[in-house]
Amino acid sequence: QPDAINAPVTCCYNFTNRKISVQRLASYRRITSSKCPKEAVIFKTIVAKEICADPKQKWVQDSMDHLDKQTQTPKT
């Protein structure tokens, strides 16, 4: 869906240098706005801290997979 006009845009300018344990992560959102210098993942931790991460890194993709799989309703 199109972005709301004049909606505030959150961008990431630097990425974390360290791998974060999935046990510390609560959710993620992707940054895709053309107004930002780079695509990014923003992880929110269980203590509500937001951390920018590089979506090209394998640990980042694995962490996103983990968070998504956690929320799937089991189908029998």
């Epitope: 869906q1 993620y28 992707r30 695509e39 979506p55 993709q61 997979d65 968070l67 998504d68 799937q72």
Partner: nanobody
Framework: EVQLVESGGGLVQAGGSLRLSCAAS????????MGWFRQAPGKEREFVAA????????YYADSVKGRFTISRDNAVNTIYLQMNSLKPEDTAVYSC?????????????????WGQGTQVTVSS
């Protein structure tokens, strides 16, 4: 700017097959989970299938499980939906979307950058 373009829809008889494609541009495609949804006239948008960024995990609605297969080719920035044993109730506009929020693969609010869709009509 992110763009998604679907193709491959058409008119097919019940029991037939179609293969839909969704070509993406304007994003680092290989790092995004993707999904297929459908919307029939007068009905709400319905989840069909989803795939994670690397293509190792797939998820399906119960109504299409065993008949539809989602896949992706990150080299050409495209996802596919192979639809077999089609039924009249599969008739809808099929759209792909990019998953940008964590959470259930079947929840439309978790997705953004929807394509315009491709019409699939299954006649009896």
């Amino acid at each position: 700017e992110v763009q998604l373009v679907e193709s491959g829809g058409g008119l097919v008889q019940a029991g037939g097959s179609l293969r839909l494609s969704c070509a993406a541009s304007g994003l680092t495609f290989s790092t995004y989970p993707m999904g297929w949804f459908r919307q029939a006239p007068g009905k709400e948008r319905e989840f069909v299938a989803a795939i994670n960024s690397g293509g190792s995990y797939t998820y399906y609605a119960d109504s299409v499980k065993g008949r539809f297969t989602i896949s992706r080719d990150n080299a050409v920035n495209t996802i596919y939906l192979q639809m077999n044993s089609l039924k009249p109730e599969d008739t809808a506009v099929y759209s792909c979307a990019v998953k940008i929020y964590s959470g259930s693969y079947s929840s439309p609010p978790g997705y953004n950058h929807w394509g315009q869709g491709t019409q699939v009509t299954v006649s009896s």
